[in-house]
């Protein structure tokens, strides 16, 4: 008989263990929901304000009718200033008028003053031609003013009022482009 | 946690065509750009194409002319399309999402192989 209540006090012990872990399961799964909650109405609360502000362009970005861009503080390789522009939703600047060139230039004048700035302009190897990371031709005028002496991958760059060439795996600034939000207005 | 689930890969012949898609699924608020990267044997992993949240493009030289990327934002799904294959495009091949808190998810990658 004590051994049949000893039992029944063990199994009843067992069951209350039980309990008390979901109860405490069920405690970590609220806090994590509350957690959740809390992220998702702080970045709804984000959206709406930044969509109320709606500023066409980020903080520390210009911007040009259509176009954002961000001029670096940092210097890396070509490869890496492009994917630094994709981190941000951007793509290394792709110049696709004389007038965006004038932006560009003057805007880096007041800005920063002399210094070579990374655009997305590459040369193929094999054929030789330039083109944007997009695939497209640069318009003649936006050709890159000395052909560089490498054996490396070649790249354009912005120094000045000057489109330039050089090897892709020297450090430079380098500057992003992304489209500016349109106003729903 | 995001999981990236990529497929579409694997064996075809020199000039032939293949195309990678990539399902981003789980936790993700806000992408700012997907791509797709690429590791060769013995060599280093390199960016092939890339699309931003707004639809601008970056391809690789290598990639220029012969491969498309494309997106489907509502689905969180990027396409690369890969035509006149050579045998130097043999490599696995990694879709990536930089997204907005500015950290980079990647996919388990998938083998493409072209032979001659």
């Known amino acids: 008989k004590l051994l049949q209540v000893s039992t029944i006090a063990m199994q009843q012990q067992e069951k209350l263990i039980q309990q008390e872990r979901a109860l405490l399961n069920f405690t970590e799964w609220k806090r994590s929901c509350a957690l959740q909650m809390k992220y998702c109405q702080a970045f709804m609360q984000n959206s709406l304000s930044s969509a109320h502000n709606s500023s066409p362009c980020p903080n520390n970005w210009i911007q040009n009718r259509e176009s954002c861009y961000y001029v670096s503080e940092i210097w890396s390789i070509w490869h890496t200033s492009q994917e630094n522009c994709l981190k941000e939703g951007s793509t290394l600047l792709q110049i696709e008028s004389k007038e965006e060139m004038d932006f560009i230039t003057g805007s880096l004048r007041k800005i920063k003053g002399s210094y070579d700035y990374w655009v997305g302009l590459s040369q193929d190897g094999h054929s030789g031609r330039w083109l944007w990371q997009d695939g497209s031709s640069p318009s003649p005028g936006l050709l890159p003013a000395e052909r560089s002496q490498s054996a490396n991958q070649v790249c354009g760059y912005v120094k000045s009022n000057s489109l330039l060439s050089s090897n892709c795996s020297t450090w430079k600034y380098f500057i992003c482009e992304k489209y500016a939000l349109r106003s729903s207005v | 946690q995001v999981q990236l689930q990529e497929s579409g890969g694997g064996l075809v012949q020199t000039g032939g065509s293949l195309r990678l898609s990539c399902a981003a699924s789980?936790?993700?608020?806000?992408?700012?750009?997907m791509g797709w990267y690429r590791q060769a044997p013995g060599k280093q992993r390199e960016l092939v194409a890339a699309?931003?949240?707004?639809?601008?493009?970056a391809y690789a030289d290598s990639a220029k002319g012969r491969f498309t990327i494309s997106k489907e934002s509502a689905r969180n799904t990027v396409h690369l399309q890969m035509s006149s294959l050579k045998p130097e495009d043999t490599a696995v091949y990694y879709c990536?999402?930089?997204?907005?808190?500015?950290?980079?998810?990647w996919g388990q990658g998938t083998q493409v192989t072209v032979s001659s």
């Open positions: 990536t999402i930089w997204a907005a808190d500015y950290q980079q998810y």
């Open positions: 789980g936790s993700i608020f806000n992408i700012n750009s």
């Open positions: 699309i931003t949240v707004g639809g601008r493009l």
